[in-house]
């Protein structure tokens, strides 16, 4: 079968890292510099992604695989394949269209990315505030006063913070 297919299409013999060159009677030519083909039988090689500006090269391009980018210090990746780099902020801040802004009272952000989220409302679980929240940290909820009896555990660990999803830009 492989031989039959080759007689029909000489390009099928060209391996990854090469292309079927119409200018040279369909012989298999190596991909030009800064280009690649990740599968066999290709009639062109794809130009490598260039990690420029706030992007930096995480993985160099080879003749058979594309380059991969991440972000320079002070930025973090957004989107599949690190399609964008977004500016880092400090803990206790969120990125707005006007730059990094402190979290409003009653909200916090414990990371360099993402949005400020509301403090946990301890009373919804019938608990009381054991440690006050800050711009950087959520409140710590403790047991309700009724639960405070000798020998009872005094602190309930807070639920782990969920990382909100990011929409590009």
């Amino acid at each position: 079968f492989e031989r039959t297919r080759s007689l029909q299409d000489p390009c099928s013999n060209c391996p990854a890292g090469t292309f079927c060159d119409n200018n040279r009677n369909q012989i298999c030519s190596p991909c030009p510099p800064n280009s690649f083909s990740s599968a066999g039988g290709q009639r062109t090689c794809d130009i490598c992604r260039q990690c420029k500006g706030v992007f930096r090269t995480r993985k160099e391009c080879s003749s058979t695989s594309n380059a991969e980018c991440d972000c320079t210090p002070g930025f973090h990746c957004l989107g599949a394949g690190c399609s964008m780099c977004e500016q880092d902020c400090k803990q206790g801040q969120e990125l707005t269209k006007k730059g990094c802004k402190d979290c409003c009272f009653g909200t916090f952000n414990d990371q360099k990315r993402g949005i400020c989220r509301p403090w946990t409302n301890c009373s919804l679980d019938g608990k009381s505030v054991l440690v006050n929240g800050t711009k950087e940290r959520d409140v710590v909820c403790g047991p309700s006063p009724a639960d405070l009896s000798p020998g009872a555990s005094s602190v309930t660990p807070p639920a782990p913070a969920r990382e909100p999803g990011h929409s590009p830009q």
Partner: antibody, heavy 118, light 112 residues
Framework: QVQLQESGPGLVKPSETLSLTCTVS????????WSWIRQPPGKGLEWIGY???????NYNPSLKSRVTISVDTSKNQFSLKLSSVTAADTAVYYC????????????WGQGTLVTVSS | EIVMTQSPLSLPVTPGEPASISCRSS???????????LDWYLQKPGQSPQLLIY???NRASGVPDRFSGSGSGTDFTLKISRVEAEDVGVYYC?????????FGQGTKLEIK
């Protein structure tokens, strides 16, 4: 091999919204940037903007307030909307595969002429 | 944005003779990885543009070797060693360093 095909109305009235779709065949829309470029009759080329398959976008500042580019990976398509058009938006509109997010347009559609006229 | 300037804007050439097109950018296109973010495109009459050269000097796969690109920084040249009738059209240089990518005005190559 990768092929791109633009589709949409050839005539749009002034102040209305121009809408075009680019269908990608012979390859997946994933892992690349996809651009729109236009060319007014008898003039040069102008980049409009790109979208990455994940939805990230970047637009030419000169058109940013009027442009929206979106992607539908399930249909292997991406689309252009240009609002509040005038006669100056009359052009051949091309979609192209963008290898690096604003560079090296290796695969182009055949282009579609959009005329803005009442 | 980066401004691209081409010369000449019109280029009559006899078949078999060489041709040369110049492109100048308003700022350097040489990036820190020693990569010049400069592409050359040919738009044949009634067709879409096609990529000829990327990174200043790399021929795209399938492009005849009579086309070559050279230069670095702000000054670039596209050369055709022996012009053929099928080479007629408008040649554009484009900078790909910064968004928005910007094109030169175009050079129209015609056969004498």
């Amino acid at each position: 091999q990768v092929q791109l095909q633009e589709s949409g109305p050839g005539l749009v009235k002034p102040s209305e919204t121009l809408s075009l779709t680019c269908t990608v065949s012979g390859g997946s829309i994933s892992s690349y940037y996809w651009s729109w470029i236009r060319q007014p009759p008898g003039k040069g080329l102008e980049w409009i903007g790109y979208i990455y398959y994940s939805g990230s976008t970047n637009y030419n500042p000169s058109l940013k307030s009027r442009v929206t580019i979106s992607v539908d990976t399930s249909k292997n398509q991406f689309s252009l909307k240009l609002s509040s058009v005038t006669a100056a938006d009359t052009a051949v509109y091309y979609c192209a595969r963008d290898q690096s997010g604003g560079g090296s347009f290796q695969h182009w559609g055949q282009g579609t002429l959009v005329t803005v006229s009442s | 944005e980066i401004v691209m300037t081409q010369s000449p804007l019109s280029l009559p050439v006899t078949p078999g003779e060489p041709a040369s097109i110049s492109c100048r950018s308003s700022q350097s296109l040489l990036y820190s990885n020693a990569y010049n973010h400069l592409d050359w495109y040919l738009q044949k009459p009634g067709q879409s543009p096609q990529l000829l050269i990327y990174a200043g000097s790399n021929r795209a796969s399938g492009v005849p070797d009579r086309f070559s690109g050279s230069g670095s920084g702000t000054d670039f040249t596209l050369k055709i060693s022996r012009v053929e009738a099928e080479d007629v059209g408008v040649y554009y240089c484009m900078q790909a360093l910064q968004t928005p990518p910007t094109f030169g005005q175009g050079t129209k190559l015609e056969i004498k």
